[in-house]
Interface confidence: low
């Protein structure tokens, strides 16, 4: 999902895919977002390091798990790519950096009266990527008011130096602010000459053009179609540049298509993603995952939601289909483009929509305002252990949350079954994000057995824990997999990154939410919690969480759901949402069943006949 937080004084260790110099962490994050493999980045400001070579260093990183170990480094800033962040994705960077000289190839010098004018000149020059401007107080008089237009092989500075009375910045062409204008024409049967800056495989000239638009040095392109005479060059997209900024020559050539970068378009740029689906085409690449889904659109959505997936092939071969679902091959490559494109197949292929600015709210989770009290929308696969416990009497409704802890086991709160102990009225939905997606055809699990803690009493807060054994085991997928349980009697770990999730009320007298909500809540000591609940006994088998000022909390409908904390890169189930005085009230934290205190009970109840525990433990 979309992760926007930055980590101060932290540096991700390992996983490097590229490095460059950038003036700040935000620009580094943008470069990570647009790099096909980058999921994480670390940035070293000038103040964070003595090594001149590493100052302003931006390190782009990939990770199979989506995370990397963080090491403490004073001044360093780390964070996540903004892939999947919808409208936050932009190559536009307007900031001006004072006291900084961004080095590159100086290809044009002129006198201007302000840094804004210098930026405008860069934006209106087809080859300019960034610029430096010497102010009127620069120490060498002959350089004052100089505007230096620059470029570099990678589009980022070749070095960045701290230099008084110099201001630097980037071209605003990616902001669609260029005065140059663009050529939308696509030229059939025409090949452009000049310098090739990159070569990728694309299914058509339009994908080639979009890649050219977002490549730092591509000004125009030539695409060789799938019927081009030389087989090894079919579907090749050649990204090109020239000294003049336009092709120096063009040659009539059957089965080639040429065109220009659209970076100089005014007001609108193409989205940095490719939404078209190509029937009868297979995209080759490194296998990330294979999953059975219903329909090519669902395959594309699955690829989009799996952040490392770049492109996919949905196979309609009879051997790749089971009933109405067929195999969805999720793939990636070094450059984000297929390594092979095959035609006349029984597949359909396309690209991840992770870089689309618009699209479903399920991909970008920043638009809705009513939620779990003080929370935000979750995204697909973010909390794959979360389940919805629903009761089907005449109508069907969501009553509680729960956590998948094994193929056939769900952990929830005992009070969810108060007055509803009949297992056949319950339906358990896993691997879902939006409750509105549930139709009469959505698969659900039925309950084989409800195991309520033997010491639980209705209307008492103690031992509010229950296990559900499902009638049939669930397969694990990216969207449906278990949460690890804590170690028995885990009291020494200090958890600082804890989250509560659920579809519960967004206010005390609210209603069930459609999109799974998440809220980051700090743990509160039991002593502090007891002070807030003097009429109740807060036992060591409970854990409390909440903000002193209130405003963020679990609420009705979240009961039974998880309180999870991330520690050393691993999520653990620390608590089960149990009770509280109202929702998100000031100085009234939420009270959760402390899972670590019930590990013996959980192990005993989930023990299979062969003596192996049927749930996940981080042991």
């Amino acid at each position: 999902g979309c992760l926007t937080q930055l980590y101060e004084n932290a540096f991700f260790r390992g996983g490097d895919v590229a490095s460059m110099y950038t003036p700040n962490a935000q620009y580094c994050q943008m470069r990570c977002t647009f790099h096909p493999r980058c999921l994480l980045f670390s940035f070293l400001p000038a103040s964070s390091i003595n090594d001149m070579e590493k100052r302003f260093g931006c390190f782009l990183k990939d990770s199979v798990t989506g995370t990397l170990p963080k090491v403490h480094r004073t001044g360093a800033v780390s964070g996540h790519s903004l892939k999947q962040c919808g409208h936050q994705i932009s190559a536009c960077h307007r900031d001006i950096y004072k006291g900084v000289d961004m080095r590159g190839v100086n290809f044009n010098v002129s006198k201007v009266s302000s840094v804004e004018e210098c930026q405008k000149r860069c934006t209106s020059n087809i080859r300019c990527q960034f610029f430096s401007y010497a102010t009127q107080t620069f120490h060498k008089a002959e350089y004052r008011n100089n505007c230096l237009l620059k470029y570099s092989p990678g589009g980022t500075p070749t070095a960045i130096k701290v230099l008084s009375n110099v201001e630097s910045g980037f071209s605003l062409k990616p902001c669609a602010l260029s005065e140059i204008g663009c050529h939308m024409n696509i030229f059939q049967h025409l090949a452009f000459s000049d310098v090739d800056v990159a070569r990728v495989l694309t299914p058509d000239a339009f994908v080639c053009r979009t890649i050219c638009t977002y490549h730092p040095n591509c000004l125009f392109f030539t695409f060789y179609t799938n019927v081009w005479k030389i087989e090894s060059q079919r579907n090749v997209c050649l990204l090109k540049t020239s000294e003049s900024g336009t092709p120096s020559s063009s040659t009539p050539q059957e089965n080639t298509i040429s065109g220009y970068s659209l970076l100089t378009c005014k007001r609108t740029l193409p989205e940095p993603c490719h939404s078209k689906i190509y029937p009868g085409v297979d995209f080759g690449g490194e296998e990330l995952n294979v999953t059975f889904v219903k329909g090519v659109n669902v395959c594309q959505e699955t690829c989009t939601k799996m952040i490392r997936c770049q492109f996919f092939t949905y196979s309609l071969l009879p051997e790749d289909c089971k009933e109405e679902k067929c195999k969805c091959f999720l793939r990636l490559s070094m450059d984000g483009s297929p390594t092979r494109i095959a035609y006349g197949t029984q597949g359909s292929s396309g690209y991840s929509l992770r870089l689309c600015n618009t699209g479903d709210n399920s991909v970008c989770t920043t638009k809705t305002s009513t939620r779990i009290v003080g929370g935000t929308n979750s995204s697909w696969g973010e909390w794959p252990w979360q389940v919805s416990l629903q009761v089907k009497l005449t109508a069907q409704r969501h009553l509680c949350g729960g956590s998948l802890i094994g193929h056939q086991w769900v952990l929830t709160a005992a009070h969810c079954f108060d007055g509803l102990p009949l297992q056949d009225v319950w339906r358990i939905y896993s691997g879902i994000l939006n409750l509105s997606d549930i139709t009469k055809d959505t698969p659900f699990s039925q309950i084989k057995e409800i195991i309520i803690h033997q010491n639980y009493k209705v209307s008492e807060g103690n031992h509010d824990i229950a296990l559900i054994k499902l009638q049939a085991p669930l397969n694990y997928t990216e969207f449906q997999k278990p949460i690890c349980l804590p170690s028995k009697g885990d009291t020494s770990t200090i958890y600082t990154n804890c989250w509560v999730t659920g579809w519960g009320f967004s206010k005390e007298k609210g209603e069930i939410q459609n999109i799974l909500q998440k809220v980051n809540i700090p743990l509160v000591t039991n002593e502090e919690c007891q002070k807030r609940y003097q009429d109740y006994k807060i036992t060591q088998r409970m854990v409390c969480a909440g903000y002193k000022e209130g405003g963020k909390d679990a609420c009705k409908g979240d009961s039974g759901g998880p309180l999870v904390c991330k520690h050393n890169g691993m999520w653990r189930l620390v608590g089960i949402t149990s009770w509280g005085e109202g929702c998100a009230r000031r100085e009234q934290p939420g009270v959760y069943t402390k899972v670590a205190e019930y590990m013996d009970w959980i192990l005993e109840k989930t023990q299979s006949s062969d003596g192996k525990a049927q749930m996940q433990s981080p042991a």
């Epitope: 939404s275 689906i277 029937p279 219903k294 329909g295 090519v296 659109n297 959505e301 949905y314 309609l316 009879p318 289909c321 009933e323 109405e324 067929c326 359909s348 479903d360 709210n361 399920s362 509105s436 139709t439 055809d441």
Partner: antibody, heavy 120, light 107 residues
């Protein structure tokens, strides 16, 4: 050539029954989901029923549920719609249509239709 | 059930004009929106599926856009054969529902 050909329509009295057939050719019928869509004279399109490739799952519009049954015989490349307890409001042109996962379950191939008239 | 509302219900235009038909879903249907053309006495024909993908053989003057609840069908440079009825349809969840249709007439 990919083709769907409906048959079995006609005039029937209210309460009566009719069985529509749809013969498929030019594609591997057993791979595809199929459906029926109807259009009352001078009116818009209404989805009636749908069946998965194996025949194991069928879905119906509320207006026909319990009265109509969709089925298929993959060995004969034929789709059927058994219509019982017919009412005047069932009078319509009935189209059989193919839906495919590659088009997000859009109806990409349609038959020419067969007219069903329910009248006394 | 998901309701599909098409507007306008009828539209007058001339050959060579550009027209836009809109379709609104009563709840989000992602991009599972299809457009059909129906000529008098004929079966409907698929024009666009998945909101914006042109069906093979359909002229490029037809285009579709939108996601979530709001969608549009645009026809640039109207041809005489385009003056017929257009329907939108959602294939997001059953029952699959159609819009009431838009009749495109010659001015």
């Amino acid at each position: 050539e990919v083709q769907l050909l409906e048959s079995g329509g006609g005039l029937v009295q209210p309460g009566g029954s009719l069985r529509l057939s749809c013969a498929a050719s030019g594609f591997t019928f057993s791979w595809y989901y199929m459906g029926w869509v109807r259009q009352a004279p001078g009116k818009g399109l209404e989805w009636v029923s749908w069946i998965v490739s194996s025949g194991g799952l069928t879905l119906y519009a509320d207006s026909v549920k319990g009265r109509f049954t969709i089925s298929r015989d993959n060995s004969k490349n034929t789709l059927y719609l058994q219509m019982n307890s017919l009412r005047a409001e069932d009078t319509a042109m009935y189209y059989c249509a193919r839906t495919t996962v590659t088009t997000g379950d859009a109806f990409d191939i349609w038959g020419q239709g067969t007219m069903v008239t329910v009248s006394s | 059930d998901i309701q599909m509302t098409q507007s306008p219900s009828s539209l007058s235009a001339s050959v060579g004009d550009r027209v836009t038909i809109t379709c609104r879903a009563s709840q989000s249907i992602s991009r599972y929106l299809n457009w059909y053309q129906q000529k008098p006495g004929k079966a409907p024909k698929l024009l666009i599926y998945a909101a914006s993908t042109l069906e093979t053989g359909v002229p490029s003057r037809f285009s579709g856009s939108g996601s979530g609840t709001d969608f549009t069908l645009t026809i640039t440079t109207l041809q005489p054969e385009d003056f017929v009825i257009y329907y939108c349809q959602q294939s997001y969840s059953t029952p699959y529902t159609f819009g009431q249709g838009t009749k495109l007439e010659i001015k």
